[in-house]
């Protein structure tokens, strides 16, 4: 029961996390204009991974896509790649984990297969979460570097009457969404891996030995009972695989004001 709960919770947490990673990737507010010196501005700039936007005090918002691929900074391309890899891995992980869920029966799928699939999806979620966290962190680092560079530039070359204001950018909402979503996906993945261990208790390997007559030598292989012991086929209700066994009778079944682009 605890295994099913852990697996189910891991799946739900990962699902929320991946939805968050997708949302963060699509959001335009990865970096937003720093309003420290001017909290109320007539023109507000913010940028995403795919386009940059300007919201005027009039209420009009204009967004322009980055239509160039080669002209974009390598760091931005790297962040895009990390986020997309995170989404793809997460999506595959979700697909795999649906079939791995203990409360869902698919034909005569063995518990060993479910355990393997649970572990696979768990690892995928962990990598997906790490990709998202890495992507967001790289972007945040890029912002911090640029912020201090532009701050230094603000106080240079101000000779005479004319001042040129350089727009500084700070962390946007998407970064926080990305960090939280990546963390949730990571936690979900860990929970799936824990659930996998519960699906495959290792003590079953030892119980399998007790069925045989005394005096008959049995070569125990730590990897499980896939290797033949010379006793023919396995007992009907036992599913033996690398890492443990489980009886079939233990299985429980559970039924967006003016925007223009």
């Amino acid at each position: 029961m605890a295994v099913t709960a852990c697996q189910g919770l891991g799946f739900v947490v990962s699902l929320i996390g991946i939805a968050g990673i997708i949302a963060a990737t699509c959001m335009d507010q990865w970096s937003t204009q720093d309003l420290y010196n001017n909290p109320v501005t007539a023109v507000f700039n913010y940028q995403g991974l795919w386009r940059s936007c300007v919201r005027e005090s009039s209420g009009f918002t204009e967004c322009r896509g980055y239509f160039t691929l080669l002209g974009l900074p390598a760091m931005l391309q790297a962040v895009r790649a990390l986020m997309i890899v995170g989404i793809v891995l997460g999506a595959i992980g979700l697909l795999v984990s649906i079939f791995a869920l203990k409360c869902i029966r698919i034909g005569s799928m063995e518990d060993s297969a479910k355990a393997n699939m649970t572990l696979t999806s768990g690892i995928m979620f962990i990598v997906s979460g790490l990709c998202a966290i890495a992507g967001v962190s790289v972007f945040a680092n890029m912002l911090v570097t640029n912020f201090w560079m532009s701050t230094a530039n603000m106080y240079t070359g101000m000779g005479g009457m004319v001042q040129t204001v350089q727009t500084r950018y700070t962390f946007g909402a998407a970064l926080f969404v990305g960090w939280v979503a990546g963390g949730l996906t990571l936690i979900g993945g860990v929970m799936m891996c824990i659930a996998c261990r519960g699906l495959a208790p290792e003590e079953t390997n030892y119980k399998a030995v007790s069925y045989h007559a005394s005096g008959h030598s049995v070569a125990y292989k730590p990897g499980g009972f896939k290797a033949s012991t010379g006793f023919g086929s396995n007992t009907k209700n036992k599913k033996i695989y690398d890492g443990g066994a489980r009886t079939e009778d233990e299985v429980q079944s559970y039924p967006s004001k003016h925007d223009y682009v």
């Epitope: 007539a42 005090s57 209420g59 003016h258």
Partner: antibody
């Protein structure tokens, strides 16, 4: 067509308050910010502040902060500008103006003359 | 606050001749986000409210005759009336639309010589 109709001329004593109205028609009232600009006799234009009719948020010129209050009545598509603690130098024509692309003012009211005299 | 300085204060031009009005801002009005200059030009005739001519420094409002054109970037801007007509006699104002408080230039009075 877009129309901004302002209330009539006012004569006030120093220290009093004046409330000027601006009724909008011919467009979606909540879709455009409304600004107030004044012009003293023979002088230039001076921006006082604006109000977002959708959220009710305001931005005021620091010069008038504490003296000016902008409000809206969505039911009648009307914007109000109240200026308190009137002084003789507040004698001016007060305009309401709709904000457009580039934060420019594309439509203006006919103006309301406010005279502050003892 | 951004200070807008217009020159000249007044301008007398013959009918059909070119009129040029300059506007200088104390800070750049160029927004890096969309590379647009947040400067607006208005025309005001006696006893009337101002009328929008040009926004984003060079974008003419629909209905405005094409003899009116705006140019410039950053801190220096120009309004040009290519061929002055009698109905163009008015006071012209430039406005900073980039940073609060929104500020206007002192105005340039255009007359017929």
């Amino acid at each position: 067509q877009v129309q901004l109709v302002q209330s009539g001329a006012e004569v006030k004593k120093p220290g009093a308050s004046v409330k000027v109205s601006c009724k909008a028609s011919g467009y979606t009232f909540t879709g455009y910010n409304m600004n107030w600009v004044r012009q003293a006799p023979g002088q230039g234009l001076e921006w006082m502040g604006n109000i977002d009719p959708y959220y009710g948020g305001t931005s005021y010129n620091q010069k008038f902060k504490g003296r000016v209050t902008m409000t809206i009545d969505k039911s009648t598509s009307t914007v109000y500008m109240e200026l308190s603690s009137l002084r003789s130098e507040d004698t001016a024509v007060y305009y309401c103006a709709r904000m457009y692309h580039g934060n420019a003012f594309d439509y203006w009211g006919q103006g309301t003359t406010v005279t502050v005299s003892s | 606050d951004i200070v807008m300085t217009q020159s000249p204060d007044s301008l007398a031009v013959s009918l059909g001749e070119r009129a040029t009005i300059n506007c200088k801002s104390s800070q750049s009005l160029l927004n890096s986000g969309n590379l647009k200059n947040y400067l607006t030009w208005y025309q005001q005739k006696p006893g009337q409210p101002p009328k929008l001519l040009i926004y984003w420094a060079s974008t003419r409002k629909s209905g405005v005759p094409d003899r009116f054109s705006g140019s410039g970037s950053g801190t220096d801007f120009t309004l040009t009336i290519s061929s002055l007509q009698a109905e163009d006699v008015a006071v012209y104002y430039c406005q900073n639309d980039y940073s609060y408080p929104l500020t206007f230039g002192g105005g340039t009075k255009v007359e017929i010589k």
